[in-house]
């Protein structure tokens, strides 16, 4: 480790005196930092000597000597005070720049250690410091403002009490830069825009940044627009706003608009699309099939997507029949806006009753006219079955009527013994009716079919069962001939 002579750590001299600082090491040594022209530097073997014949207050500072060849990287330092009664301060820099929350060193060095007790930091022209400015003082280094804030970027002076009066240093300008977290924040409104040719339109591009050094521009397709910029400061951020106002839009104004802002951290952009149309429009669509089938008792949501400009002047859901004159309850109708020009309308139909099958129409109106979208709702029912014994053309006939939706198909079973329902083990014979006669088939209603089983002689110890099924379920009816006639059994549910 090098050694400095005189031994220090401090040396106090008067202005005009000669000062010699000798640094001696095992190998070659050198003095740190830029040496002012007032010093003479020469080497003398393993030592380096700094000398001045006329010390001034400006020589006040710490002088450090290092030994480059020393693997431990040791150094020695001596602090020189040149105590000038007229100059209590030596200011090493007139401007200091730090980032917010860093400690800021204001390098005003006291030229006389005796004055330390009476030092203070003030703002330019003796103004007090900002409230809660947390600072400390080191005679070797100057004043340190701890965790400097942006607002503490001020002009400061160091003050020392000399003979009962305050003597100020020259001013030091502190610049506290905000830590820029990223590119400026952007908003471009509206997110999309539709106008009829000849209407007025406005697009606003605004950017905000933590400090004032940032740029913003608005671009139409690939053309940068020349728009006057409005600047503001609020919520502790700088705002720049570009407003494009178009009195009467035409097709050439349509296209992509990009709002672009940049700062030292980079660029940020956001875009919107402007569509110019010849006239008002109103389009209705649905992702659902317009023909709906739902099992009775279940629920259904009918959904319509609307694209419109200008906005809707009216809309409603209507039940067009055929069963009753009831209308959908308003509380079951729901509207959500996806964005300015697209909306979704939903009609909720919970626990559907037979009288609620039929046509449901959504109607909407804007200056472009009326539009309607109609759903057809058919309810699905499990089959209901009944069997009667009758005589047709003199022949005994079992007549099975099955009613449901979709159209049920019919199967006859003959089984041994008297039973309410044939099970597989008892079945003696099965007849499938491929084409039962359709008795009724009205829109939105159950389909009723009829199947005949002609039986010359019904065997008394046997059961005849008509079974019907469709995609919803099945139903059956059992017929048991008895000596005095015949007996029928609906199945036990």
């Amino acid at each position: 480790i090098p050694v400095i002579e005189p031994s220090g750590p401090e040396l106090v001299v008067k202005p005009g005196e000669t000062v010699t600082l000798r640094c001696v090491g095992n190998g070659s040594v050198e003095w740190d930092g830029p040496i002012s022209p007032h010093w003479t530097l020469y080497s003398d073997g393993p030592s380096s000597v700094l000398t001045t014949n006329n010390a001034t207050f400006q020589n006040t500072r710490t002088y450090r000597c290092t030994e480059p060849g020393d693997p431990l990287g040791g150094s020695a330092a001596i602090h020189l005070y040149v105590k000038d009664p007229a100059r209590p301060w030596n200011v090493l820099a007139k401007e200091v720049v730090v980032f917010e929350d860093q400690d800021a060193l204001l390098p005003c060095l006291l030229t006389d250690p005796v004055l330390e007790a009476g030092v203070s930091l003030v703002r330019l022209r003796g103004r007090p410091l900002l409230r809660h400015t947390n600072y400390s003082f080191s005679p070797w280094h100057g004043f340190i403002i701890h965790r400097a804030k942006f607002i503490q970027g001020q002009d400061y002076q160091c003050s020392a009490l000399m003979g009962g009066r305050k003597v100020m240093s020259i001013s030091i300008r502190l610049k506290v830069q905000k830590v820029i977290p990223g590119p400026p924040a952007l908003t471009l409104v509206p997110a999309e825009l539709v106008r009829i040719r000849g209407e007025a339109a406005q697009i606003v591009c605004s950017a905000s940044n933590i400090d004032v050094d940032f740029d913003v521009f608005l671009q139409h397709n690939t053309t940068k627009l020349a728009i006057p910029q409005r600047s503001d400061f609020h919520d502790n951020r700088y705002q720049k706003v570009l407003t494009l106002s178009l009195g009467q839009v035409d097709f050439q104004h349509a296209g992509n608009y990009s709002c672009v802002a940049s700062n030292v951290q980079g660029k940020h952009s956001t875009s919107m699309f402007f569509q110019v149309v010849e006239s008002a429009y109103l389009d209705l669509s649905s992702e659902q099939n317009l023909i709906q089938e739902v099992t009775v008792g279940e629920g259904l949501n009918l959904k319509v997507m609307v694209e419109a400009y200008p906005g809707l002047q009216g809309f409603n859901w209507t039940y067009l029949g055929p069963f009753s004159d009831h209308q959908p309850e308003p509380k079951l109708a729901n509207a959500t806006t996806k964005d300015t020009y697209r909306h979704t309308f939903t009609l909720s139909l919970p626990r559907l009753k037979p009288s609620e099958a039929g046509r449901y129409s959504f109607l909407a109106r804007n200056p472009g006219g009326w539009r309607a979208l109609t759903f057809e709702l058919t309810l699905r029912y499990p089959p209901e079955v009944s069997v009667i014994w009758t005589s047709i053309n003199g022949s005994g006939t079992l007549l099975c009527a099955a009613s449901g939706y979709p159209q049920p198909n019919v199967t006859w079973l003959q089984c041994a013994g008297h039973t309410d329902r044939c099970d597989e083990a008892q079945v003696l014979q099965v007849w499938v009716d491929p084409h039962p006669e359709v008795l009724s088939q009205e829109p939105f209603q159950k389909v009723t079919v009829q199947s005949l089983l002609t039986a010359e002689t019904l065997e008394h110890n046997q059961t005849y069962e008509c079974r019907a099924h469709n995609s919803v379920g099945s139903g059956s009816w059992a017929f048991i001939p008895i000596s005095a006639g015949a007996r029928t059994h609906p199945p036990d549910e």
């Epitope: 103004r127 900002l130 400061f233 502790n236």
Partner: antibody, heavy 122, light 111 residues
Framework: EVQLQQSGPELVKPGASVKISCTAS????????MNWVKQSPGKGLEWIGD????????TYNQKFKGKATLTVDKSSTTAYMELRSLTSEDSAVYYC???????????????WGQGTSVTVSS | DIVLTQSPASLAVSLGQRATISCRAS??????????IHWYQQKPGQSPKLLIY???SLESGVPARFSGSGSATDFTLNIHPVEEEDAATYFC?????????FGGGTKLEIK
């Protein structure tokens, strides 16, 4: 809910001292400056000083140096103000007020105690 | 010390109308576009309540009918529309340097 609960009213004789307390609840006591403000009918609101509970550092209004002493007990989250050598001029309502610290340096007093009335009378 | 002068000392405003209170500082209380003036409301027998900080920022929970503006040495508190419950004394306060100082107060009466 943030609350600053002050001690009750005081009736004291001239020349005596009084110590007022202010207990903070539902706030991180050490993250704020605790201010003391005097309100007297003739003088409006006057700032006495503040204390930073974190390190006990104080700042006083020159006018109240020697009159008021601010202390803090971190364990009980209580701030104290002692007023000494009381005269009729010290009769007033004294408030403690929390000063909110924000990154932006907006030092405003966002929570106030209910006030302690001090009457100096022989 | 920075002196804050409020005007008027008192004013009477009809329900639903606008109340405007001014606060003038003896020197600038602004720096870097940050305006260190705050507004408080005090009702009889109660402690002051912060309404606006940094000249124009509304304290949480304060109705939007209160607004503040101004910079450097001239600041304004506006209340519009005035409601019955706004009858109180309003104070401005600076916090740019020690000691913090308060205005003399403006007493608002509702007609």
């Amino acid at each position: 809910e943030v609350q600053l609960q002050q001690s009750g009213p005081e009736l004291v004789k001239p020349g005596a001292s009084v110590k007022i307390s202010c207990t903070a609840s539902a706030i991180t006591f050490t993250d704020y400056y605790m201010n003391w403000v005097k309100q007297s009918p003739g003088k409006g609101l006057e700032w006495i000083g503040d204390i930073y509970p974190n390190n006990g550092g104080t700042t006083y209004n020159q006018k109240f140096k020697g009159k008021a002493t601010l202390t803090v007990d971190k364990s009980s989250t209580t701030a104290y103000m002692e007023l000494r050598s009381l005269t009729s001029e010290d009769s007033a309502v004294y408030y403690c007020a929390r000063e909110k610290i924000t990154m932006e340096y907006y030092y405003a007093m966002d929570y106030w105690g209910q006030g302690t009335s001090v009457t100096v009378s022989s | 010390d920075i002196v804050l002068t409020q005007s008027p000392a008192s004013l009477a405003v009809s329900l639903g109308q606008r109340a405007t209170i001014s606060c003038r500082a003896s020197e600038s209380v602004s720096s870097h576009d940050i305006h260190l003036i705050h507004w408080y409301q005090q009702k009889p027998g109660q402690s002051p309540k912060l309404l606006i900080y940094a000249a124009s920022s509304l304290e949480s929970g304060v109705p939007a009918r209160f607004s503040g503006s101004g910079s450097a040495t001239d600041f304004t508190l506006n209340i519009h529309p005035v409601e019955e419950e706004d009858a109180a004394t309003y104070f401005c306060q600076q916090s740019i340097e020690d000691p913090p100082t308060f205005g003399g107060g403006t007493k608002l009466e509702i007609k």
